[in-house]
Structures are given as structure tokens and as C-alpha cells.
Interface confidence: low
């Protein structure tokens, strides 16, 4: 049995306003982010400061439903987005093959009991490649400058490593890869444990999900439950802190 923990924010948490008042929970999102045309981006929200039971998370773009992660039934990706949207990591959503038309507001809507509905907002701007290379305009300027500086330093280090051909090359390449991701305007994640594609887990130390083993295919229940073309083999999601 594989277990996985919620991927947690390494940086850049923003707090989104709640959908309605008097609820204790808060939705944490990346706020405004940007990505390069043709690339991919992770949209992620995290509900905290509440003991409410999450039963479903909806991802929407303006008035269009992109995806649903249901507590018992797993992931559903809207047919019109199935070729460009992938579930995860966690309760998040990965947008692929980005186009300029993907620019806009994205909403994560957490359905909970007994609190009700929480909504988080993310603004994504998809930049033309030439623009994106000069940094993401929506990132905090200081972080952007730091990232750019690190890229320059990192490039120099790589040149030195390539020339000297020392054994530490692999480790430096790994660091360089991380820095490239930062400079492209994507959020950095710090996984506490591996989170296989298609799984979604909210609670720390929560089990893999109500659909069982983490797989890149439907669990038996999903396959049995959804005899519908719009449901793909996307794995499953779990929201529960209780374990037997």
C-alpha cells in the first residue's frame, strides 16, 4: 500500500478571500502566476484552518468547469479539456500545452461539510516564449531578480563543471533544473513523500484514497461507476483524515 502526504507550499503562499463569511477555513493559492506558451503549469489550492470534511473540489475557468475531484469517485476531467488537463499533484490541476487563450482567472471551489463552499482564485498569464524568457511579470520582483541572478550563476557553474568533468556534475544539474523552474515562473513544491500522478490527498498522513492503490488507471469502483466516455483513467482522490 502506497501512502502519500499532501504536497506543501515551499514559497509564495497567498491567502484568498472566502466565498462566504463566518467560516474559519482559509484557501491558500499561488495568487498570480505566469507560464510560457506551450509549457505547463500547476494550479494548486490548499484548504487550511478548518476541520470541515471536504467532499469535492471543482476547478473552474471563468464559467467553464475544468475538472472535479470527488471524495469517493475520483477525478473527472471535462471532455473539452481532457487532452490538456491532468489531475494533480494532490488536489491541484496541471494545465499542459498552454496557449495565450489560457490566460485568465481560475477558481478552486472546495465543497465542505459543515462549513459550505470555499473558493480560491488564481490568475494565470500565458506569455509568448520571448517574453517568458525574461522572467515572469507577476512574480514578486525581488524573487524574480534573485531567480534570474541564480540562473546566471548556475549557468557559469555548469560551464565550469562541463569543462572540469567532475563527478559532482549530476548534483549541479539537478540544482540547475530546479532554478530553471523558478525562473520560468512556476511555483516550487517540496513533497514530503512521493505523490503519484492521479492521486489527490488533502490530509497529512491520509491514506491513498477511497479508490485504493495509487495507479495511473481507474480503480475498480471508478471503472464500474462511470460507464461514461467523459470519465478517463485518472486515478483517484481522497480527502479524509480518518483511518481505520
Amino acid at each position: 500500500m502506497r501512502w502519500c502526504l499532501l504536497l506543501i507550499w515551499a514559497q509564495g503562499l497567498r491567502q484568498a478571500p472566502l466565498a462566504s463569511g463566518m467560516m474559519t477555513g482559509t484557501i491558500e493559492t499561488t495568487g498570480n502566476i505566469s507560464a510560457e506558451k506551450g509549457g505547463s503549469i500547476i494550479l494548486q489550492c490548499h484548504l487550511s484552518s478548518t476541520t470541515a470534511q471536504v467532499t469535492q473540489v471543482n476547478w473552474e475557468q471563468q464559467d467553464q468547469l475544468l475538472a472535479i475531484c470527488n471524495a469517493d469517485l475520483g477525478w473527472h476531467i471535462s471532455p473539452s479539456f481532457k487532452d490538456r488537463v491532468a489531475p494533480g499533484p494532490g488536489l491541484g490541476l496541471t494545465l499542459q500545452s498552454l496557449t495565450v487563450n489560457d490566460t485568465g482567472e481560475y477558481f478552486c471551489i472546495y465543497h465542505t461539510y459543515p462549513d459550505g463552499t470555499y473558493t480560491g482564485r488564481i490568475f494565470l498569464e500565458v506569455l509568448e516564449s520571448s517574453v517568458a524568457e525574461h522572467g515572469a511579470r507577476f512574480q514578486i520582483p525581488l524573487l524574480g531578480a534573485m531567480a534570474a541572478t541564480l540562473v546566471v550563476i548556475c549557468t557559469a557553474v555548469i560551464v565550469v563543471v562541463a569543462l572540469t568533468r567532475k563527478k559532482k556534475a549530476l548534483r549541479i544539474h539537478s540544482v540547475e533544473g530546479d532554478l530553471r523552474r523558478k525562473s520560468a515562473g512556476q511555483e516550487e513544491w517540496s513533497p514530503s513523500a512521493p505523490s503519484p500522478p492521479g492521486s489527490c490527498v488533502q490530509a497529512e498522513a491520509a491514506p491513498a484514497g477511497l479508490c485504493g492503490e495509487q495507479r495511473g488507471e481507474d480503480c475498480a469502483e471508478l471503472h464500474d461507476y462511470f460507464n461514461v466516455l467523459s470519465y478517463r483513467s485518472l486515478g483517484n482522490c481522497s480527502f479524509f483524515t480518518e483511518t481505520g
Partner: antibody, heavy 115, light 109 residues
Framework: QVQLVQSGAEVKKPGASVKVSCKAS????????VHWVRQAPGQGLEWMGT????????SYNQKFKGRVTLTADTSTSTVYMELSSLRSEDTAVYYC????????WGQGTTVTVSS | EIVLTQSPGTLSLSPGERATLSCRAS???????LHWYQQKPGASPKLLIY???NLASGIPDRFSGSGSGTSYTLTISRLEPEDFAVYYC??????????FGAGTKLELK
């Protein structure tokens, strides 16, 4: 064929606990959720909670939170529903059902709470 | 909480007639998560229709389902004597995770 066989009727006093079993057969036990639903005399259906035997993940109806506990024994393909602090209004027939669609149901277990 | 309201509470019809049972949700739900069950006295509920319109295994095709958003309907095109029972709609995925309607009793006129 798929079957869910529940334990027999129970008579309990207020304040006591009851543990109802649901033995599954005819399918892969660890691949489907098992839900619990109850029905008071002459009333409708009320969902209590669900457990996924594959990893023991559970979810409960907030109304029963703290009073109901769902467990599963994969070695015997059996799910258990324990309801504590019983009161007279818990008198009902308790059903287990397979999967989100509840495509197969147990025969029901009558629990009577009376002093 | 998503509340499902079924109407009418009781429907009195004769064999051969058409029965139309309604289920309204207090807020919009996905049609994927709306199911119908039949229950006869002293018996366990039985799945009739899943995902709004899909016929469960072994259910005769005189039963059909439709609807979207907040309004859903179960139709029995031509009533047979064995169809007289209580019918429940159920939603999945709201909060609580599962809720049932109060039921419609289909009785012999």
C-alpha cells in the same frame, strides 16, 4: 455473484453500543467502497458513512461523527459498523451497500434500542 | 446541505399507466451523481437508475431517467403490478457526501 450478508437483529439498551457486520463475497473486496445507510421505521433512507477496505479510508455523515465507527477486516472480507451511545431514535434497519452507486445491498440488520 | 425534495409524496395509478416521479435538488448537482432506487416493503433498496439516465443491470427498459441541474425525473412508461413500491432519489458528492430524497410512494389506485 456479488453478495453482502449482514449479521442478525440486535436489541440494545440506551447508552449501549452495537456492532453490525457485513460480509462481502463475489467481488474484489478491496476495490469497492462499502457504505452504511439506515432506515427508521416508516421513514426514509439516511447515509451514515463509507469505508474503503483497500486502505481503510473513511468518511462519515457529520450527524453521526463521534458515534459511528467503520472498520474492515480484509482477511474475512467483512466491514463493521459500530454505533455507540445508543438512543431510542437509533432504532432502525441498518444496511450496508457496495460502491458509490450502491449497486448491491445487504439484507439489513434490525437494531432495536429500548429500555 | 443539499436537500432532495421528491414529489408527489404519494402517487396513485393503475397498471398500464405512465408514472412520472420528480426529484428536485436545493442546489445544482452533477447529473453524474444522481441515482434512483426502488424499495418494496420488508426488502432492501434496489438500484434502478444511475448517473441520471443509465439503467442498472437487470432493470426493465420501461424505467427511464432524465434531468440536469436541480430537476430530475424518473419515468415508468407502462406500470406493471410489481412496480408499486417506494422510490428514492439519491445525490452523491455534495455534503453530506450522500443524501436521499424522502421518497415517493407509488400505490395501486
Amino acid at each position: 455473484q456479488v453478495q453482502l450478508v449482514q449479521s442478525g437483529a440486535e436489541v440494545k439498551k440506551p447508552g449501549a453500543s452495537v456492532k453490525v457486520s457485513c460480509k462481502a463475497s463475489g467481488y474484489t473486496f478491496t476495490s469497492y467502497n462499502v457504505h452504511w445507510v439506515r432506515q427508521a421505521p416508516g421513514q426514509g433512507l439516511e447515509w451514515m458513512g463509507t469505508i474503503y477496505p483497500g486502505n481503510l479510508a473513511t468518511s462519515y455523515n457529520q450527524k453521526f461523527k463521534g458515534r459511528v465507527t467503520l472498520t474492515a477486516d480484509t482477511s474475512t472480507s467483512t466491514v463493521y459498523m459500530e454505533l455507540s451511545s445508543l438512543r431510542s431514535e437509533d432504532t432502525a434497519v441498518y444496511y450496508c451497500a457496495r460502491s458509490g452507486t450502491m449497486d448491491y445491498w445487504g439484507q439489513g440488520t434490525t437494531v432495536t434500542v429500548s429500555s | 446541505e443539499i436537500v432532495l425534495t421528491q414529489s408527489p409524496g404519494t402517487l396513485s395509478l393503475s397498471p398500464g399507466e405512465r408514472a412520472t416521479l420528480s426529484c428536485r435538488a436545493s442546489s445544482s448537482i452533477s447529473s453524474t451523481y444522481l441515482h434512483w432506487y426502488q424499495q418494496k416493503p420488508g426488502a432492501s433498496p434496489k438500484l434502478l437508475i444511475y448517473n441520471t439516465q443509465n439503467l442498472a443491470s437487470g432493470i426493465p427498459d420501461r424505467f427511464s431517467g432524465s434531468g440536469s441541474g436541480t430537476s430530475y425525473t424518473l419515468t415508468i412508461s407502462r406500470l406493471e403490478p410489481e412496480d408499486f413500491a417506494v422510490y428514492y432519489c439519491q445525490q452523491f458528492g455534495g455534503y453530506p457526501l450522500i443524501t436521499f430524497g424522502a421518497g415517493t410512494k407509488l400505490e395501486l389506485k
